[in-house]
């Protein structure tokens, strides 16, 4: 099992749309997946949690944050629209 | 079985309209992102736009923007390319497909513009 | 917007040949892209995705590689039915593009 992460580190304009991809490899057919963030202050985050019929995001990505579980493509991509500079933090995707 | 087919070919008059459809089976557009793409006569691939029929947001490329227009009908799992003042430029087979990368492909929906 | 440029515009190759076919970007797009074979009247078709990685169904002989803004799609050992057309495409920004295409002749 695996997962990948594409994006090279992101360097935006705010208001702008920014996909972050994340890619996974597993013999399960319903996988839990998350996206987490650690920001410059190294507070660690949720941020978003989906498997295959649903997806679900912490009270501060109401609005500009979704995530895009393309099953076809085994991808579970964190959609940040618009982005904002507080959202400048290292994002990892996990299952 | 994941498919994408496509409207039949179109022949219209410059200055005219056109609406191509792309319908998706065996996944949900919902789910994904639908790109449509220009391919000219003896020419390369351009890509036209995307929508993410979700929340019905788009993006194109500039060159494109004001000429076409891409919409998405979830109910019947279908993505739209509507082309507006159509020249002889607009000749050409266009290609629906989905995801990031392109996995899946329409069989391409060949326009030819003439008078 | 991202410039794919393709070298060189047709590769002549004979059957058994390895083949490479180079697309540059003109900005840093990490390995955020992809490689598509088009047959004659046939719609383009998938061979590999973030660079490097394989896709079920398409043959061994086809391989990717690089980072950055320099790419290779390779060929091992060229048959008749791989006479087509290839392009690069990336993903990493707005708008999408794809390079301007090879064409590979079997000599």
């Known amino acids: 099992d695996k997962v990948t992460q594409s994006s090279p580190d992101q360097t935006v304009a705010s208001g702008s749309e920014v996909v972050l991809l994340c890619t996974y490899d597993t013999v399960y057919s319903n996988p839990d997946l998350f996206w987490y963030r650690i920001r410059p202050d190294y507070s660690f985050q949720f941020v978003f949690y989906g498997d295959n019929s649903r997806s679900e995001g912490a009270d501060f990505t109401q609005g500009r944050f979704s995530v895009k579980h393309i099953l076809t493509q085994k991808a579970f991509h964190l959609v940040i629209s618009p982005v904002r500079t507080e959202d400048s933090a290292t994002y990892y995707c996990a299952f | 079985e994941v498919q994408l087919q496509q409207s039949g070919a179109e022949l219209v008059k410059p200055g005219a309209s056109v609406k191509l459809s792309c319908t998706a089976s065996?996944?949900?557009?919902?789910?994904?992102?639908m790109h449509w793409v220009k391919q000219r006569p003896e020419q390369g691939l351009e890509w036209i736009g995307r929508?993410?029929?979700?929340?019905?947001?788009?993006k194109y490329d500039p060159k494109f923007r004001g000429k076409a227009t891409i919409t998405a009908d979830t109910s019947s799992n279908t993505a739209y390319l509507q082309l507006s003042s159509l020249t002889s430029e607009g000749t050409a087979v266009y290609y629906c497909?989905?995801?990031?990368?392109?996995?899946?492909w329409g069989q391409g929906t060949t326009l030819t513009v003439s008078s | 917007d991202i410039l794919l440029t393709q070298s060189p515009a047709i590769l002549s190759v004979s059957p058994g040949e390895r083949v490479s076919f180079s697309c540059r970007a003109s900005?840093?797009?990490?390995?955020?892209i992809h490689w598509y074979q088009q047959r004659a009247n046939g719609s383009p078709r998938l061979l590999i995705k973030?660079?490097?990685e394989s896709i079920s169904g398409i043959p061994s002989r086809f391989s990717g590689s690089g980072s950055g803004t320099d790419f290779t799609l390779s060929i091992n050992s060229v048959e008749s039915e791989d006479i087509a057309d290839y392009y690069c495409?990336?993903?990493?920004?707005?708008?999408?593009?794809f390079g301007g295409g090879t064409k590979l002749e079997i000599k």
């Open positions: 497909s989905e995801g990031i990368y392109f996995d899946y």
């Open positions: 065996g996944f949900n557009i919902r789910d994904t992102y």
């Open positions: 929508i993410d029929p979700a929340n019905g947001n788009t």
């Open positions: 900005q840093n797009i990490g390995t955020i």
């Open positions: 973030y660079a490097s």
């Open positions: 495409q990336q993903s990493n920004s707005w708008p999408y593009t």
